[in-house]
């Protein structure tokens, strides 16, 4: 039950995180005009990964896309790439994790396969979250560098007569959305990995001990509550689970069914 809850919660948290990463990537407010200690402009500038916008105090907003690819800063391209990779990995992770959910039954999918898929999606979520956090952090670093550079020459003038308003940019809402979303995706991924450990039957550190009686043989399975007799098809076909624990001899007998990559 705890495993199902952990897996389900991990999925929901990751889903919210990936939705946030998508939202952050699409948002226009990655950097916004710094209003502190600046002249009160009747124009508010803000920029995203895909376009820059200007909102006039009249309420009119105009956005222009970055229609060039080669003319854009390499850092911006890198941030775009990181965010897209994060989204793609997260989307694949979500798809995989849907099938991995313990509460969803798909044909005769074994718990071992579900454990595999849970681990895979968990890793994907972790990488997705890291990509988003890295992308947002790279952009934030770029902003901080540019901010102090523009502060150094806040007013550039021609012989001190004509002043030009230097537009400084600070952190936009998208950065905070990205950081939070990346963190949630990361947490969701970790939860999926934890859930995977609970789903996967674990190997014990000792071999099963068989006691041979004169009439019939009984194999005592130290890991489980049940003991199966040596005759019939019972031993061959029945998998004995005890909270994910399994016996050594099962692994050796059926490598094709119970091997974990």
């Amino acid at each position: 039950m705890a495993v199902t809850a952990c897996q389900g919660l991990g999925f929901v948290v990751s889903l919210i995180g990936i939705a946030g990463i998508i939202a952050a990537t699409c948002m226009d407010q990655w950097s916004t005009q710094d209003l502190y200690n600046n002249p009160v402009t009747a124009v508010f500038n803000y920029q995203g990964l895909w376009r820059s916008c200007v909102r006039e105090s009249s309420g009119f907003t105009e956005c222009r896309g970055y229609f060039t690819l080669l003319g854009l800063p390499a850092m911006l391209q890198a941030v775009r790439a990181l965010m897209i990779v994060g989204i793609v990995l997260g989307a694949i992770g979500l798809l995989v994790s849907i099938f991995a959910l313990k509460c969803i039954r798909i044909g005769s999918m074994e718990d071992s396969a579900k454990a595999n898929m849970t681990l895979t999606s968990g890793i994907m979520f972790i990488v997705s979250g890291l990509c988003a956090i890295a992308g947002v952090s790279v952009f934030a670093n770029m902003l901080v560098t540019n901010f102090w550079m523009s502060t150094a020459n806040m007013y550039t003038g021609m012989g001190g007569m004509v002043q030009t308003v230097q537009t400084r940019y600070t952190f936009g809402a998208a950065l905070f959305v990205g950081w939070v979303a990346g963190g949630l995706t990361l947490i969701g991924g970790v939860m999926m990995c934890i859930a995977c450990r609970g789903l996967a039957p674990e190997e014990t550190n000792y071999k099963a001990v068989s006691y041979h009686a004169s009439g019939h043989s009984v194999a005592y399975k130290p890991g489980g509550f049940k003991a199966s007799t040596g005759f019939g098809s019972n031993t061959k076909n029945k998998k004995i689970y005890d909270g994910g624990a399994r016996t050594e001899d099962e692994v050796q007998s059926y490598p094709s069914k119970h091997d974990y990559v």
Partner: antibody
Framework: QVQLVESGGGLVKPGGSLRLSCAAS????????MSWIRQAPGKGLEWVAT????????YYLDSVKGRFTISRDNAKNSLYLQMNSLRAEDTAVYYC???????????WGQGTLVTVSS | DIVMTQSPLSLPVTPGEPASISCRSS????????????LTWYLQKPGQSPQLLIY???TRESGVPDRFSGSGSGTDFTLKISRVEAEDVGVYYC?????????FGQGTKLEIK
Amino acid sequence: QVQLVESGGGLVKPGGSLRLSCAASGFAFSSSAMSWIRQAPGKGLEWVATMTVGYIYTYYLDSVKGRFTISRDNAKNSLYLQMNSLRAEDTAVYYCARQGYGNAMDYWGQGTLVTVSS
Amino acid sequence: DIVMTQSPLSLPVTPGEPASISCRSSQSLLNSGNQKNYLTWYLQKPGQSPQLLIYWASTRESGVPDRFSGSGSGTDFTLKISRVEAEDVGVYYCQNNYIYPLTFGQGTKLEIK
């Protein structure tokens, strides 16, 4: 068509108060920034105050800050200018205007005269 | 505050002749975000309210005759009337629409000779 009609002007003693109103019609008032501009007799235009869309920001001329208050009632399609502690130099025709592209005042009212005299 | 300086303050013109009014701002009105100049031109005809002619320094307001044109960038701007007509008389104002307070120029009075 767009119409802006100012009212509330008149003669007032120095230190007195007056409330100007501007009734708007013919456009989406709630999604438009509105301004008050004044013109002293025989003088040029002087911007007084602006209220942006959604009550977010209000801006004032330094000499009227703390004395004048711009407000709006979107339900009534009306803009207001509450003027307190009036001075002789506040005597002017007060225009109500809508801000359009480029923050330009694209539509103006006919104006209302405010006279501050003892 | 941005100071807007217009010249000349008075402009007598013969009908059919061109006219030019200059406006200079103490700070640049160019916004780096959209590369637009936040300068506006108005005409106030005698006994009337002002009317918008040009915004963004060079964009003509709808309904404004094409004999009116605006140019300039940064701090220096010009309003040109290709052929002055009798109905063009009045006071022309330039306005800073970039930084609050939204200051106006002193005005240029255009009159027919």
